[in-house]
């Protein structure tokens, strides 16, 4: 049967793809696996292969993939076979804009906002979960509260500021009872008086590779707090930065590849090239996070001619400190993330 392309079709004459992977291209049963599982580089998942036989290091963005050598599911990657129609034998690992997320066993759709508990509001963006605290930690002005302290109050989700005055009698910090800085009170106050507020960006949702960071801001016509998001990449997963630490040093705060590069997202390529800086790593227990950064707008062009833009974290400088938390606890950093809002916008 001859193929007659429909009006919207490009020329899809099948062209053979070479499998550059050393992995088996197809499944063989019964399974034959090496005696011990492979050791995967930092950030690469150890998964069961597509044959449901052996452990393998998942293929990463841009790698060839087959029914046996599958793409990293934890990074929202899938095997795009569109370049090998109609054989569907060898594809390329691509990232779909709009993959859902799983948090604590619950699946959320791309773009969906949800509250896993009363303290945080989260959004699923392209496979990554970004959260912002609902309990806003705006310190009371030092002028009338030199010694503020946060206390738990029964029946309230958020801790509230109280003021230790000279008589050591705690009192609520907010004069004329403006809601004592709990989340609901603040929102009402914003709406009444429209005091512009933008929270700091939350930490990147991944310690390496593509993640998402969110913040809330009421700088809009309705003066209503809305969640903004940006993509972030603190460090590449496929580079072992430890090897770049100079002799006698314990940390490399900033890592910058020599060559400029184009960003890729879901198979789409940025319209210009960039030379980004990444945060480095330490030999000891310290971790490195951005402290001078900004948000840039990156335009992407897709193979089908469509384009889109995304806000992206641009790192200028990083610092390394000891307040490291479990990288899998996405809420941990929100507890103690430094407020660098004056230098990190």
């Amino acid at each position: 049967t001859a193929l007659s392309p429909a009006p919207t079709t490009m020329d899809f004459t099948p062209a053979p793809l070479e499998d550059t992977s050393s992995r088996p291209q197809f499944c063989k049963w019964p399974c034959e696996c090496p005696p011990s599982p492979p050791r995967c580089p930092l950030g690469v998942s150890l998964i069961t292969d597509g044959c449901e036989c052996c452990k393998m290091c998942a293929q990463q963005l841009g790698d060839n993939c087959t029914e046996a050598a599958i793409c990293d599911p934890h990074r929202g990657l899938y095997c795009d076979y569109s370049g090998d129609r109609p054989r569907y034998a060898i594809g390329v690992c691509a990232q779909v804009v709009g993959v859902g997320c799983v948090l604590d066993g619950v699946r959320y759709n791309n773009g969906q906002s949800f509250q896993p508990n009363c303290k945080y509001n989260c959004t699923c963006i392209d496979g990554a979960v970004g959260c912002t605290p609902l309990c806003l930690r705006v310190r009371p002005p030092r002028l009338w509260c030199p010694h503020p302290r946060r206390v738990s109050i029964p029946g309230h989700c958020c801790e509230q500021w109280v003021c230790e005055d000279d008589a050591k009698r705690p009192r609520k910090t907010a004069p004329r009872d403006t809601g004592a800085f709990d989340a609901v009170g603040e929102v009402e106050a914003w709406h009444r008086n429209c005091i512009a507020y933008t929270s700091p960006w939350s930490p990147c949702s991944t310690s390496c590779g593509l993640g998402v960071s969110t913040r809330i801001s009421n700088v809009n016509a309705q003066c209503w707090p809305e969640q903004e998001s940006r993509l972030c990449n603190l460090r590449p997963c496929d580079v072992d930065i430890h090897t770049l630490i100079k002799a006698g040093k314990k940390c490399l705060a900033v890592y910058q590849p020599e060559a400029s590069m184009n960003f890729t997202l879901a198979g789409c390529i940025s319209t210009r090239s960039y030379q980004p800086k990444y945060c480095g790593v330490c030999m000891d227990n310290r971790c490195c996070i951005p402290y001078k950064s900004k948000t840039i707008d990156v335009s992407f062009q897709c193979p089908d001619g469509l384009g889109f833009s995304r806000q992206v974290l641009w790192i200028n400088a990083c610092f390394c400190n000891l307040s490291c938390r479990n990288p899998n606890d996405i809420f941990a950093d929100l507890e103690s993330y430094p407020d660098f809002s004056e230098i990190a916008n």
């Epitope: 049967t1 079709t9 029914e67 054989r87 034998a89």
Partner: antibody, heavy 118, light 106 residues
Framework: QVQLVQSGAEVQKPGASVKVSCKAS????????IHWVRQATGQGLEWMGW????????GYAQKFQGRVTMTRDTSISTAYMELSSLRSEDTGVYYC???????????WGQGTLVTVSS | DVVMTQSPSTLSASVGDRATITCRAS??????LAWYQQKPGKAPHVLIY???NLNSGVPSRFSGSGSGTEFTLTISSLQPDDFATYYC????????FGQGTKVEIK
């Protein structure tokens, strides 16, 4: 597990059109092409064409060009095949097929019987 | 157009027999060939793909061989469940199917 569930049987008059749906589940709908294959009553399998649910691109077999239209609704993970100007020889079962390697483990729909009769 | 020709059209055999079905392509399809089994009222399902790769869950009595234009499906010892219609399919240049081989009880 991967499932392709098709709409129910249809009876149409010659010259009319029929639209068959195919709802995908158990995998990410936009990641794989959907092909359509028909089996005229008592006959073999005949490929009609394909559609890429990610961008809506299509390719049709010459025999069906001008009569077939393949579309999708990604919000409900559903592909559609519409065949117009129906004739009696279009009577048969229409299958949607997930486009992975020879559909190995990828599944076919259960089929939709279309009867064209005056 | 790639034309696929299967033979025989009907194969009469008994349980335990070895059954062989051949498929010829009008031009080379390399090893981009699949074999399907179909039972009445059911959708086809893949037995063999890429000429010789056994699909998951398919009994090992099924095997495929060949490349280029000549292909063979072999059932080493027919079981009662194997009496069905078998189709070859090339997928090098889109999809074309053979006309089918009905394996019936002798």
């Amino acid at each position: 597990q991967v499932q392709l569930v098709q709409s129910g049987a249809e009876v149409q008059k010659p010259g009319a059109s029929v639209k068959v749906s195919c709802k995908a589940s158990g995998y990410r709908f936009i990641n794989n092409d959907i092909h359509w294959v028909r089996q005229a009553t008592g006959q073999g399998l005949e490929w009609m064409g394909w559609m890429d649910p990610n961008n809506g691109k299509t390719g049709y077999a010459q025999k069906f060009q001008g009569r077939v239209t393949m579309t999708r609704d990604t919000s409900i993970s559903t592909a559609y095949m519409e065949l117009s100007s129906l004739r009696s020889e279009d009577t048969g079962v229409y299958y949607c097929v997930r486009g992975i390697i020879a559909a190995a483990g990828g599944g076919w729909g259960q089929g939709t019987l279309v009867t064209v009769s005056s | 157009d790639v034309v696929m020709t299967q033979s025989p059209s009907t194969l009469s055999a008994s349980v335990g027999d070895r059954a062989t079905i051949t498929c010829r392509a009008s031009q080379s399809v390399d090893t981009w060939l699949a074999w399907y089994q179909q039972k009445p009222g059911k959708a086809p399902h893949v037995l063999i793909y890429k000429a010789s790769n056994l699909n998951s869950g398919v009994p090992s009595r099924f095997s495929g061989s060949g490349s280029g234009t000549e292909f063979t499906l072999t059932i080493s010892s027919l079981q009662p469940d194997d009496f069905a219609t078998y189709y070859c399919q090339q997928y090098k240049t889109w999809w074309t199917f053979g006309q089918g081989t009905k394996v019936e009880i002798k």
